[in-house]
Every structure is written in C-alpha cells, then in structure tokens.
Amino acid sequence: AGVFELQIHSFGPGPGPGAPRSPCSARLPCRLFFRVCLKPGLSEEAAESPCALGAALSARGPVYTEQPGAPAPDLPLPDGLLQVPFRDAWPGTFSFIIETWREELGDQIGGPAWSLLARVAGRRRLAAGGPWARDIQRAGAWELRFSYRARCEPPAVGTACTRLCRPRSAPSRCGPGLRPCAPLEDECEAPLVCRAGCSPEHGFCEQPGECRCLEGWTGPLCTVPVSTSSCLSPRGPSSATTGCLVPGPGPCDGNPCANGGSCSETPRSFECTCPRGFYGLRCEVSGVTCADGPCFNGGLCVGGADPDSAYICHCPPGFQGSNCEKRVDRCSLQPCRNGGLCLDLGHALRCRCRAGFAGPRCEHDLDDCAGRACANGGTCVEGGGAHRCSCALGFGGRDCRERADPCAARPCAHGGRCYAHFSGLVCACAPGYMGARCEFPVHPDGASALPAAPPGLRPGDPQRYL
C-alpha cells in the first residue's frame, strides 16, 4: 500500500507564438482545479480503461480575473498535493492523465459551470520510495509543469511497496537474516509471512500465508506468466502443466467494493460500479457533493450542496458511470454492419464501409454498379439475377455488350413466365401475383411464407415490363 503524490508547479501559456487567451475574464472570473487519473501501465488497453490505480481531484485554486490587455500569465494554482492512495503493490510502470479544469464563477443559473481546459497524458516508469520526478507536458498552447512520486505507507517498503517493516525488537541490530529497512534504519525488514514458495519478484502479501500476484502473473505462487493461450477455464490462462488455470477465487469473490458497490471482473482485475455519492477504485470515497466537482469529463452535476443530498452526473456523449469517469468504448458494441471499420472519434462515431455498402452504420447494401457504364441502352439496377446491368431487349452480359435472351436472367418473380417481346420482356404472373415482374403477391397467406398460388384466383393478365 502507498500513495502517489502529484505536485502541480505551473499551468500557463507554453513557449512560442500563439499564446492562448486567458480562460478567465472580468465578466467571467474563474478558478482552476486539477484531476489526475492513474492506470497500471503494463496493460495495452490502458488508454481506455478506467482509473484502475485510482483518481484524485485537487482543491479549487484562487479566483482569477484577467487584467484587460495583459497576456495570459501562469494561472493561480490550488494549494497542496494531489494524492492517490493505492492499496496493492505499486506497479512500477503506470499511465497518467492530468486534466486542468476551469470553474466559471459568473452568475450562471444553477451554480458554477465546469469546462475542461487541457488534458495531458503519458506513460512512465517509477519506483516507489524514489525522489520526486519532474515533468513538463504540453496540451495545445498550454504548458503544465509538475512533479510526482510514489511512496509506501508503513509498514510497506521497497520499490513496489511489497516488503513489510516492523520496529526493531532489539535496540542494536536486526534478527538473523533480516536487513534494516532503509530509509527507516530504526526498523527491520519483517520476517517473511507470505505463503511458502510465493514468488519474491511477482508475488506479495499483506496477510500471513497469502500470495497475491502483481499484474501479469498468476498461479497460487505467482510463478506463471499470464499468457494469451486459449483455455477452457473461465478464469483464463495459466497452470504450468496444462497452460490453463483451474478456476479459483476470482477478483470479485468477497466483493471488494464498499458502500454497496457492485463488482464486475475485468480481464486483469475487477471494476466497481459505485452508487451515487461514492467513488474511488473500491467505492471507498464518500461525502461528495456538486461542490466537490465529482463529475469528470465535462459531466454536468445536479444535486444539493449539503453532504446528505445525492448528486447526479449527466454525462456527455462518450462517457458513462456514476461520475462520468468511464469512457464508453462505443466500437465494442460493433455498431458498423457488414464488416465496416469502426472509428471512435470521441465527439462522434464513424463507420468506414466496405465496398458495396453505405450509410452511417454501413447498413445499406448497395449494388456494385456505381460508376459502371451499361452498353446498348442498358441501365444499372439491382435485380435480374447476377447481371449488374438491366439490359435492353436483345442484349445481355455484364455490361450489355452481348446479344442475349432477355429472359435468361429470370426477371419474373414468384414463378412468373417470361416472354421476349418486341417492345420489351413480358412476365405472365403465376396466379395470385401481380406487378411488372410479379413481385407483389395479391393475397399473401401469412407474413413469412407465401403460397405459390392461393386457390380460387384466376391467373393475372401478362404484365409488360418496359
């Protein structure tokens, strides 16, 4: 267990031309606040996954009003650190998103308005217990300077916060085989309490006798790398002999979600869906009102200001969750039909259709004749079997270049008989059908199956198809 700490040093215009306009004005004074989202960086889906390592919201900064005519300076910042507690081991590699939010303090109806000013993201390698790391990130014309570190909470120590330390039992030195706990030289590394055989590199424990695995490892002793081999087991890959893990306890067993949150398994861990008023990895953070700005990603907060009244976040398109903290992977619903490629552009969804299909979701099956020229007076239509062109009488073939029997393409539906005619082809419809090509049943007997010829109806007159 430990805490990730983020210190914002400055937020203001970046170097170079095109300085951004100040986000605040005399008419609309505003103040800034920041949100940080952390994710374990080993997972390839880190960019779209929820803030699995945790998230934090800063306090509001001082109110700022732009001085007319003055360039936008570095904006006044909130006091203090952003702290993201983590319960399990520190993963070493992590992804971060830092959002700069503006709270407008004009006389808006319904209280202050929030808008996202800038978002920066990155992936870093960081050992717990190390010094502050400094970073500069740019988002458009804005520049954010910050420092960060990960530190372990006692009794945990080490680069992953997986070793435990205890106060010395003797004043002079540690027991046999046990080292002093740097930097706490007055403490000693605790005796190994994990399950016997638990991998020292890939496993850790918080209780005697347990063996919990770091991301990417599995098995009772955390010695088996998670592979992508296919398994029959619902718990996915693992055991050294079969390549598959016998179903064991799942991440949701015992429901790690507090305050009535519901747990769902994810490919690598679990995810809590929190009731309103609670958030955090395990729904452990509470007492939130709209004044705390709990709605992320531009969500609109509605609710009372007192701690007992619930709030509701109305999420913008593309986000969901009780705090709008989850980005909707809209392409996972496979909205593009007929093999279309789905592109989630954030503000909209686009489908890139395969040839022969069109429409917002590639739902329209087009004929392939677009741009084709049909010879000898033919027209490009769908119908009439395999021909792309509907050819004039006496011509056939793909482009109507061949002399052909106009009835060869079976242009009459529902068993109608085709006759070549000097002014076109003629379909003599079977009893009970009509239309130039017999495509309409006169009295269909039910919606799913159509009779060849309902009894008692005289054959229709031949219908000429011109």
């Epitope: 039909r337 069109a358 739902e363 329209h364 099956d365 087009l366 004929d367 239509v381 769908e382 119908g383 009439g384 509907s390 539906a413 239309g435 130039a436 090509r437 495509e439 309409f440 049943p441 269909p444 159509l450």
Partner: nanobody, 117 residues
Framework: EVQLVESGGGLVQPGGSLTLSCAAS????????MAWYRQAPGKKRELVAG???????YYMDSVKGRFTISRDNAKNSVYLQMNSLRAEDTAVYYC???????????WGQGTLVTVSS
C-alpha cells in the same frame, strides 16, 4: 437481411388523412420492390399499393385516386399517403419488400389504422 419498421398509424375520422412510413434498414430501398398491404379483422391480407425497384406504381382499385405510394431513397423509406379515408380502410397496414438479389420477401410488424367517427 432487410428490416422494416412501420409508423404513422392511428385513429382518424372519415374523410381525414394519414401518412404511413416504412423505414428499411440493412439494405437500400432503391433496389427493392416495396408495397403496402392491409388486413382487416377476419379478412385476408390484401395488396393496397406497390412500387417496383424501377419506380412503377400499382394500386388496388378501391384506393386509386385516394392513396399514393412513394419512396425516398435518401431517407431509405417508403410512404403511403392516404386521403379521403373511409371506415372500410380500417385495418392493420403492413410494409412489404421484395429483394431481387436473393429473391426473398420481408415484412414489417404492422401499424393499426382506425377510421371512425
């Protein structure tokens, strides 16, 4: 597969008007022959009006001059404009499509039209 969804039905007084819509998905209506059918209680389903993929239109005798079938390729829909409605026009109206490529027929779920004072 072609999916058809009808809308626009409802209660109307004799002499009134209604427009039924049939929205097609998964396939372009410009390549379909489409029609409106109706089925009154205790009677067989009957063809009311049709429009072929080339644009030819057909009407049953009792609706000629009162009903108009049309197609909007941009909206991928077919419409039935019904004027001078009579009590005998009361029925469930169904949208129908004939797909030439596969020689298959498709039906909507139907929309109820009631003509009554």
């Amino acid at each position: 597969e072609v999916q058809l969804v009808e809308s626009g039905g409802g209660l109307v007084q004799p002499g009134g008007s209604l427009t039924l819509s049939c929205a097609a998905s998964m396939y372009s209506v410009s390549f379909l022959s489409m029609a409106w059918y109706r089925q009154a209680p205790g009677k067989k389903r009957e063809l009311v009006a049709g429009i072929s993929n080339e644009g030819s239109t057909y009407y049953m005798d009792s609706v000629k001059g009162r009903f108009t079938i049309s197609r909007d390729n941009a909206k991928n829909s077919v419409y039935l404009q019904m004027n001078s409605l009579r009590a005998e026009d009361t029925a469930v109206y169904y949208c129908y499509a004939y797909k030439w490529r596969s020689r298959s027929t498709y039906w909507g779920q139907g929309t109820l039209v009631t003509v009554s004072s």
